[in-house]
């Protein structure tokens, strides 16, 4: 099952300033905003073909991923 990349930590850009909890990094304005202001993903209907991405981009935390599978961005912030 394909999954999203681990975080927004950059290959070609520096990691953004970490957001405080309940804030998310908005790539278009390049600063942290309340997560509720961004159209974060909803759970998909049963039987959907792939998992919904987590809610936010968060460079400073990570969780382990299974073999051949990258972890998704974590909830909270970028």
């Amino acid at each position: 099952m394909r999954r999203g990349p681990r975080s927004l930590r950059g290959r070609d850009a520096p990691a953004p300033t970490p957001c405080v909890p309940a804030e998310c990094f908005d790539l278009l304005v390049r600063h942290c905003v309340a997560c509720g202001l961004l159209r974060t993903p909803r759970p998909k209907p049963a039987g959907a073909s792939s998992p919904a991405p987590r809610t936010a981009l968060q460079p400073q935390e990570s969780v382990g991923a299974g073999a051949g599978e990258a972890a998704l961005p974590l909830p909270g912030l970028l």
Epitope: R2, G4, P5, R6, S7, L8, R9, G10, R11, D12, A13, A15, P16, C24, F25, L27, L28, V29, V33, G36, L37, L38, R39, T40, P41, P53, T55, A56, L57, P59, P73, L78
Partner: antibody, heavy 118, light 111 residues
Framework: QVQLQESGPGLVKPSQTLSLTCTVS????????WNWIRQHPGKGLEYIGY???????YYNPSLKSRVTISRDTSKNQFSLKLSSVTAADTAVYYC????????????WGQGTLVTVSS | DIVMTQSPSSLSASVGDRVTITCRAS??????????MNWFQQKPGKAPKLLIY???NLGSGVPSRFSGSGSGTDFTLTISSLQPEDFATYYC?????????FGQGTKVEIK
């Protein structure tokens, strides 16, 4: 389920202003980014611009001098105005909204054809 | 603006064929470890439908025969076994920076 529906005149005269509205259900336009895209007949997709959760706007530089995007949060609608239209503005106009954090447009209106002709 | 170039512009294929469409960006669309590359399917008279986001993630309800790969500037959309409902036009699009830009499209026709 988020749904978007475009509405507005299907025929506009040259030099006049094209006005379209996108009505959103299933989500609030005070969250996320709300976009306009157009497609000329038989051609590819062209990005017009957005209005954001805060009401800030971005317009494609190729159209910036003629475009205004606004919103009415009480009706959960956002609108496109394109001034001084010519036949080259004849297109199907779509409203769409991207997901977060990937900014991929996963919700689209069905599109509305606007013809510019006298 | 980031220019997206798709190839081929059209192709003819048969049901069951493996189909590959490529897209090249004029500059990297990677940022913060994400490839901001998306693929859409469009059928005549219909709005585009999101197939793949962030280079390799399936959109909601998209069959697993569709897959995406790539990073940086070079990306691929693959249909592992073409089905009758897959005859359509496919567009790549970058969402790294505005103005968001699209490829010119690849029309997949019946051979």
């Amino acid at each position: 389920q988020v749904q978007l529906q475009e509405s507005g005149p299907g025929l506009v005269k040259p030099s006049q202003t094209l006005s379209l509205t996108c009505t959103v259900s299933g989500d609030s336009i005070t969250s996320g980014y709300w976009n306009w895209i157009r497609q000329h007949p038989g051609k590819g997709l062209e990005y017009i611009g957005y209005i954001s959760y805060s009401g800030s706007t971005y317009y494609n530089p190729s159209l910036k001098s003629r475009v205004t995007i606004s919103r009415d949060t009480s009706k959960n609608q956002f609108s496109l105005k394109l001034s001084s239209v010519t036949a080259a503005d004849t297109a199907v106009y779509y409203c769409a909204s991207p997901n977060y954090p990937f900014y991929a447009m996963d919700y689209w209106g069905q599109g509305t054809l606007v013809t510019v002709s006298s | 603006d980031i220019v997206m170039t798709q190839s081929p512009s059209s192709l003819s294929a048969s049901v069951g064929d493996r189909v590959t469409i490529t897209c090249r960006a004029s500059e990297s669309v990677d940022n913060y470890g994400i490839s901001f590359m998306n693929w859409f399917q469009q059928k005549p008279g219909k709005a585009p439908k999101l197939l793949i986001y962030a280079a390799s993630n399936l959109g909601s309800g998209v069959p697993s025969r569709f897959s995406g790969s790539g990073s940086g500037t070079d990306f691929t959309l693959t249909i592992s076994s073409l089905q009758p409902e897959d005859f359509a036009t496919y567009y790549c699009q970058q969402s790294k920076e505005v103005p968001w830009t699209f490829g010119q499209g690849t029309k997949v026709e019946i051979k």
